[in-house]
């Protein structure tokens, strides 16, 4: 029986050319973590297995960095990058978990009203 | 002035699909994400996915997939949405709404599209 | 999915009367960055739902200031000081912060 959450880090609004963090965690659950997906619109961005570490697929090598822990940063963000993103976790003995985070890119000039990005 | 405007109102044949349009103006079409959101009963709203006019991206409620599909046409700035396999239980009004940017709000909505499913 | 819960359900009330309605949701709405995407609607009989505040406290344009919302992490607000004929209907919140966006089950606002 699959007892396990994922907690994102939420839903996200950001600013053309900024960086931003898609966390995902796993809780309630022993079950262990053999390998986390990274997706976006059934693209593969990367991968973190628990035995051969990271791998970021080359048409993201210039703007995914790996982490933070099982994390990925999106770096230079363009409007096309808003979009839905998937965090999949392969555990044992349960089987998989699925995350979603939506990210919305805003060009500089249209932040509306006041919002608060906080780009790290 | 900000407008969204839905097709009519339909009656529709259990196991048929069918497909509403939202035709909007007054602003940028690509801009804006577009969700659709059904009332049922008069009262319960339920939100049934987006999708992002710029590069046709599209986000879904899990209970709605399979059931919806969601597309644009940049063309004519128009968003549909398709119901697939029509039951009674999708007997509701549809509604079109735009995003408020950067706010996962909804800022305009359209005058909603009623289905009735009913042999 | 994350639960919207709204009290009270409906509300009796008399012109001029203020009215508090609450959204308590199952988890917290703040995302990572500090954001709280929570939102209220009015939703007239015959109408479109109409956005009245969003991001828990800013009226959107054209709403007046008799509304008001506040709150953070789970529990929410919207106020309306004075109420005219023109605020009846149903008010609904939404959260946009995890997926997928949920709406509360709506509050009924009618005239005594």
């Known amino acids: 029986m699959m007892t396990g959450t994922i907690e994102t880090t939420g839903n996200i609004s950001a600013e053309k050319g900024g960086s931003i963090i898609l966390q995902c965690h796993l809780s309630s659950t022993t079950a262990q973590v053999t390998q986390v997906n990274w997706e976006q619109q059934d693209q593969l961005l990367a991968i973190c297995n628990a035995d051969l570490g990271w791998h970021i697929s080359p048409s993201f090598k210039d703007r995914v960095a790996p982490g933070p822990g099982l994390g990925l940063t999106l770096q230079s963000l363009t409007v096309n990058d808003t979009g839905e993103y998937f965090c999949i976790y392969h555990t044992y003995p349960d089987g998989t978990y699925t995350g979603r985070i939506f990210l919305e890119v805003l060009e500089s000039s249209v932040a509306e009203h006041g919002a608060r990005f906080q780009i790290p | 002035e900000v407008q969204l405007q839905q097709s009519g109102p339909e009656l529709v044949k259990p196991g048929t699909s069918m497909k509403i349009s939202c035709k909007a103006s007054?602003?940028?079409?690509?801009?804006?994400?577009m969700n659709w959101v059904k009332q049922s009963h008069g009262k319960n709203l339920e939100w049934i996915g987006l999708i992002i006019p710029y590069n046709g991206g599209t986000s879904y409620n899990q209970k709605f997939k399979g059931k919806a599909t969601l597309t644009v046409d940049k063309s004519s700035s128009t968003a549909y949405m398709e119901l697939l396999s029509l039951t009674s239980d999708d007997s509701a009004v549809y509604f079109c709404?735009?995003?408020?940017?950067?706010?996962?709000?909804?800022?305009?909505w359209g005058q909603g599209t009623s289905v009735t499913v009913s042999s | 999915d994350v639960v919207l819960t709204q009290t009270p359900l409906s509300l009796s009330v008399s012109f001029g009367d203020q009215v508090s309605i609450s959204c308590r949701s199952s988890q917290s709405l703040v995302n990572s960055y500090g954001n709280t995407f929570l939102s209220w609607y009015l939703h007239k009989p015959g109408q479109s739902p109409q956005l009245l505040i969003f991001?828990?406290?800013n009226r959107f344009s054209g709403v007046p200031d008799r509304f008001s919302g506040s709150g953070s992490g789970t529990d929410f607000t919207l106020k309306i000081s004075t109420i005219k004929p023109e605020d009846l209907g149903m008010y609904y919140c939404?959260?946009?912060?995890?997926?997928?966006?949920?709406f509360g089950p709506g509050t009924k606002l009618e005239v005594k």
């Open positions: 709404s735009r995003g408020l940017r950067g706010f996962y709000a909804m800022d305009y």
């Open positions: 991001g828990i406290s």
């Open positions: 007054g602003y940028s079409f690509t801009g804006h994400l």
């Open positions: 939404l959260q946009g912060t995890h997926q997928p966006p949920t």
